[in-house]
């Protein structure tokens, strides 16, 4: 499979484990790969009793769930752990958990960077 | 296409060392974090070590800290993988595998080699 | 650490037969979750990342679905060239990966 049209080649970097899997903790991820192979960004995190827990997030590997995604929506309707991916730049900030079965959109908002 | 080749297993004392090489070559070596899964006869798959892509982060199993090193060399396209105070339960097939980007699959693996640890 | 189980650790099946094994972690892996298959004196082979994506060039009668912590590989109609041991993987908690017991496919 080809690059797709909006062809991904950063995505926003969030590790939580990051101490100990001695990572960054955040930032952006340059995705690098082969010409055959498309590549999405994802996000993962844990909605406990209505607090958002980030987990991950960083590129994804070629993968037809993320084709043409533009923006990264959760759909499984109540994982241990949530997980989206989409296509182009950056398109991993904001997530949004939209079960398939029907139910509220929510949308995650990333908090404002404070000023350096 | 995308080739991975071991070398420098062989039949070592306890107490031993030896130092297992993987030349990597059709794809960019410098791009990807790499890693070491061993096999021991008849038994399953156990992660080793694994170095990213820089060589800057280097991660060990409980099994080999503080006796195996993993280096690579992104001019020579080759990772190392230095085994010191080598124990008869180290005894195994070496595989070097390149990981990708996430969820970080072992997408191409060499065909490896053995290292027995007998006295 | 993360422990994966798979079962069956052995199964002997026929041609044309229909294959599942199944993995399970000891805590939500998300879809970081890999298959490979092995035969005798050979190194393994990627066949599905991330819980469910085909590997360039893997036959589309192996499938893997699940996430969290349960996941299957089926195999939809078994073949010669399949009987091997596969093993699945968490790559969650990187790189400190963990593999499965692996289960072997024999010819019944």
């Known amino acids: 499979s080809g690059r797709g049209e909006a062809e991904t080649r950063e995505c926003i970097y969030y590790n939580a484990n990051w101490e100990l899997e001695r990572t960054n903790q955040s930032g952006l991820e340059r995705c690098e790969g082969e010409q055959d192979k498309r590549l999405h960004c994802y996000a993962s995190w844990r909605n406990s009793s209505g607090t958002i827990e980030l987990v991950k997030k960083g590129c994804w590997l070629d993968d037809f769930n993320c084709y043409d995604r533009q923006e990264c929506v959760a759909t499984e309707e109540n994982p241990q752990v949530y997980f989206c991916c989409c296509e182009g730049n950056f398109c991993n900030e904001r997530f949004t958990h939209l079960p398939e079965a029907g139910g509220p959109e929510v949308t995650y908002e990333p908090p404002p960077t404070a000023p350096t | 296409e995308v080739q991975l080749l071991e070398s420098g297993g062989g039949l070592v004392q306890p107490g031993g060392s030896l130092r297992l090489s993987c030349a990597a070559s059709?794809?960019?070596?410098?791009?990807?974090?790499m890693t070491w899964v061993r096999q021991a006869p008849g038994k399953g798959l156990e992660w080793v070590s694994a170095i990213g892509a820089s060589g800057g982060s280097t991660y060990y199993a409980d099994s080999v800290k503080g006796r195996f090193t993993i280096s690579r060399d992104n001019s020579k396209n080759t990772l190392y993988l230095q085994m010191n105070s080598l124990r008869a339960e180290d005894t195994a097939v070496y595989y070097c595998?390149?990981?990708?980007?996430?969820?970080?699959?072992?997408?191409?693996w060499g065909q490896g080699t053995l290292v027995t640890v007998s006295s | 650490d993360i422990q994966m189980t798979q079962s069956p650790s052995s199964l002997s099946a026929s041609v044309g037969d229909r294959v599942t094994i199944t993995c399970r972690a000891s805590q939500s892996v998300s879809r970081f979750l890999n298959w490979y298959q092995q035969k005798p004196g050979k190194a393994p082979k990627l066949l599905i990342y991330?819980?469910?994506i085909l590997q360039t060039g893997v036959p589309s009668r192996f499938s893997g679905s699940g996430s969290g912590t349960d996941f299957t590989l089926t195999i939809s109609s078994l073949q010669p060239e399949d009987f091997a041991t596969y093993y699945c993987q968490q790559s969650y908690t990187t790189p400190t990966w963990t593999f499965g017991g692996g289960t072997k496919v024999e010819i019944k």
């Open positions: 595998a390149r990981e990708n980007v996430a969820p970080r699959p072992l997408d191409y």
């Open positions: 059709g794809f960019r070596f410098g791009n990807y974090a």
């Open positions: 991330g819980a469910s």
